[in-house]
């Protein structure tokens, strides 16, 4: 039975040109995490973190996506086009797949959004799908 819960950084905002940390955490399960996929709203994969093989950052994002911290992902040089949903998909054994959602709003530099390491955020919990 799948008992786990994913906690994410929820709805976050950051300034254009700045950076933001996307972070998910899987709890309440003893399942082994074999892989975490980071995905964008339009079916794009940003990165994969395989537990044994390490990080693969997708070619289109190599110049402005940095792995970590931990299983998280850092988006740099933010543009207005980065606004939207992001998903962390945890592949686990034996539970299966867990998915978390983060919504990022990129604000004009003159706006009041957070800069640097993550901007403003609210924690969200997601149960398994």
């Amino acid at each position: 039975m799948m008992t786990g819960t994913i906690e994410t950084t929820g709805n976050i905002s950051a300034k254009k040109g700045g950076s933001v940390i996307l972070q998910c955490h899987l709890s309440s399960t003893m399942a082994q995490v074999t892989q975490v996929n980071w995905e964008q709203h339009d079916h794009s994969l940003l990165a994969i973190r395989n537990a044994e093989l390490g990080w693969h950052i997708y070619p289109a994002f190599k110049d402005r996506v940095a792995p970590g911290p931990g299983l998280g992902l850092t988006l740099q040089s933010l543009t207005m086009n980065d606004t939207g949903e992001y998903f962390c998909t945890y592949h686990t054994y034996p539970d299966g797949t867990y998915r978390g959602r983060i919504f990022l709003e990129v604000l004009e530099s003159s706006g009041g959004g957070g800069a640097g390491g993550g901007g403003h955020h609210h924690h969200h919990h997601h149960h398994h799908h």
Epitope: N37, H43, L45, I48, E52, L53, W55, H56, P59
Partner: antibody
Framework: QVQLQESGPGLVKPSGTLSLTCAVS?????????WHWVRQPPGKGLEWIGY???????NYNPSLKSRVTISVDKSKNQFSLKLSSVTAADTAVYYC??????????????WGQGTLVTVSS | EIVMTQSPATLSVSPGERATLSCKAS??????VAWYQQKPGQAPRLLIY???YRYTGIPARFSGSGSGTEFTLTISSLQSEDFAVYYC?????????FGGGTKVEIK
């Protein structure tokens, strides 16, 4: 230039153990990457068997996991496949391959030429 | 297990013509797809990774596209050396799987 070369018996008896080695030249297999075995039954598609990571950890196809062992011989710069309790369904060309996960994800960029293993009495 | 289904099984094309090969995944694999070429008696050769990126040294006539569950390998103008079997592979999940292959033959 990285090169991989499979070797081992071309004929194995049913219920026996298939043993193959992959000799790697041009790169030290304990320095990086993951090292894989893939097989192809005659006239059919490709099936991933498993890998050994340069760190020594292994991962196997769940459908074969109970019968497969992949190991590394550092001194000879080679890695090996053992598949136990073989049947005629294990008759295939067996390939070894390298995966550069950081650059190409789960795609395998260097392959050996393959060796045909027939399971028959 | 994610099943990759390729079509058609055989594609007959004249040299110089365009070839379009299809690969469908049984579930969403985003863009975690690679394509390989295999000639008789030879090992597979990596052509495309991440659905649309050409591997080092692969001619520009080979291109990949698609995301989610539907992927396409296009050979814009077939050369004699391109007649071979082509396989797709997914690596979205931790159990990598291949399609059954499409044989591109001379018409």
């Amino acid at each position: 230039q990285v090169q991989l070369q499979e070797s081992g018996p071309g004929l194995v008896k049913p219920s026996g153990t298939l043993s193959l080695t992959c000799a790697v030249s041009g790169y030290s297999i304990t320095s990086g990457y993951s090292w894989h075995w893939v097989r192809q039954p005659p006239g059919k598609g490709l099936e991933w068997i498993g890998y050994v990571h340069y760190s020594g950890s292994t991962n196997y196809n769940p459908s074969l996991k109970s019968r497969v062992t992949i190991s590394v011989d550092k001194s000879k710069n080679q890695f090996s496949l053992k598949l136990s309790s073989v049947t005629a369904a294990d008759t295939a060309v067996y390939y070894c391959a390298r995966m550069d996960y950081g650059n190409y994800g789960g795609a395998m960029d260097y392959w050996g030429q393959g060796t045909l293993v027939t399971v028959s009495s | 297990e994610i099943v990759m289904t390729q079509s058609p099984a055989t594609l007959s094309v004249s040299p110089g013509e365009r070839a379009t090969l299809s690969c469908k995944a049984s579930q969403d694999v985003r863009t975690a797809v690679a394509w390989y070429q295999q000639k008789p008696g030879q090992a597979p050769r990596l052509l495309i990774y991440s659905a649309s990126y050409r591997y080092t040294g692969i001619p520009a006539r080979f291109s990949g596209s698609g995301s989610g569950t539907e992927f396409t390998l296009t050979i814009s103008s077939l050369q004699s050396e391109d007649f071979a079997v082509y396989y797709c592979q997914q690596y979205y999940s931790t159990q990598w799987t291949f399609g059954g292959g499409t044989k591109v033959e001379i018409k």
